[in-house]
């Protein structure tokens, strides 16, 4: 049946940059300038992406595939294929509706996106405070007071680090 | 085709007055919060002022508030920046910019920019 229709229809021999056109008997055109066909057998080019204002060229449009864009500098990629561009933040802040905000007392960020998270509480792991935190940084938990008495060594290896966004609460 | 464009940019002297306009085309308009960025020469583009989809909600760059009021017309699918005591400083390109669908509940992105409209303020 697939090789029937192929036979019938010429549109189906039209390849990738090119679309069938019907105002032509079916024949193959190539797509106009700022359009694209990825596959075979379309009977219109689809328009390229333009990469305006936030958004920059990553790669050019051709004629059999669409234009790819990024993010000006101080930006950062959302959603698939670079959909949407987010203001980046400094350490320490998180965006929000009003613009980036500092981090609350206790929470940290130590990326340019993303939002602020609690520090750690070493006391959850039995453990104390070697290193206080900051809006940039996580606090950094030493040995437990039961480690520090007389006799007992002064450092505990390090545990393994936490992935980002799993510290406890 | 979705669209913004961007109008109302020109040369003006330091305190004086500007109305930006951005016409919105070939979407919801009224569903969509709205911003404006500018991008001074040589330095990084910025967020001057976001507003949400019915007006009620506005927020601003700390060095433009009080001088900036920025405000939109559903009925006619337009955003607006009036700009004020204007400065040297606010010499740019200033863009219009949709927020991304889902924008403040899942994310703070924006995915539909326009051209831009060129701002001078200068003696």
């Known amino acids: 049946f697939e090789r029937t229709r192929s036979l019938q229809d010429p549109c189906s021999n039209c390849p990738a940059g090119t679309f069938c056109d019907n105002n032509r008997n079916q024949i193959c055109s190539p797509c106009p300038p700022n359009s694209f066909s990825s596959a075979g057998g379309q009977r219109t080019c689809d328009i390229c992406r333009q990469c305006k204002g936030v958004f920059r060229t990553r790669k050019e449009c051709s004629s059999t595939s669409n234009a790819e864009c990024d993010c000006t500098p101080g930006f950062h990629c959302l959603g698939a294929g670079c959909s949407m561009c987010e203001q980046d933040c400094k350490q320490g802040q998180e965006l929000t509706k009003k613009g980036c905000k500092d981090c609350c007392f206790g929470t940290f960020n130590d990326q340019k996106r993303g939002i602020c998270r609690p520090w750690t509480n070493c006391s959850l792991d039995g453990k104390s405070v070697l290193v206080n935190g900051t809006k940039e940084r996580d606090v950094v938990c030493g040995p437990s007071p039961a480690d520090l008495s007389p006799g007992a060594s002064s450092v505990t290896p390090p545990a393994p680090a936490r992935e980002p966004g799993h510290s406890p609460q | 085709e979705v669209q913004l464009v961007e109008s109302g940019g020109g040369l003006v002297q330091p305190g004086g007055s500007l109305r930006l306009s951005c016409g919105a085309s070939?979407?919801?308009?009224?569903?969509?919060?709205m911003f404006w960025f500018r991008q001074a020469p040589g330095k990084e583009l910025e967020w001057v002022a976001n507003?949400?989809?019915?007006?009620?909600?506005?927020y601003y760059v700390d060095s433009v508030e009080g001088r900036f009021t920025i405000s939109r017309d559903n009925a006619k699918n337009s955003l607006y920046l009036q700009m004020n005591s204007l400065r040297a400083e606010d010499t740019a390109i200033y863009y219009c910019?949709?927020?991304?669908?889902?924008?403040?509940?899942?994310?703070?992105?924006?995915?539909?920019w326009g051209q831009g409209t060129t701002v001078t303020v200068s003696s």
């Open positions: 910019a949709r927020g991304g669908e889902g924008y403040s509940d899942s994310h703070y992105g924006t995915d539909v």
């Open positions: 070939g979407f919801t308009f009224s569903n969509y919060w």
């Open positions: 507003v949400n989809q019915n007006g009620s909600e506005k």
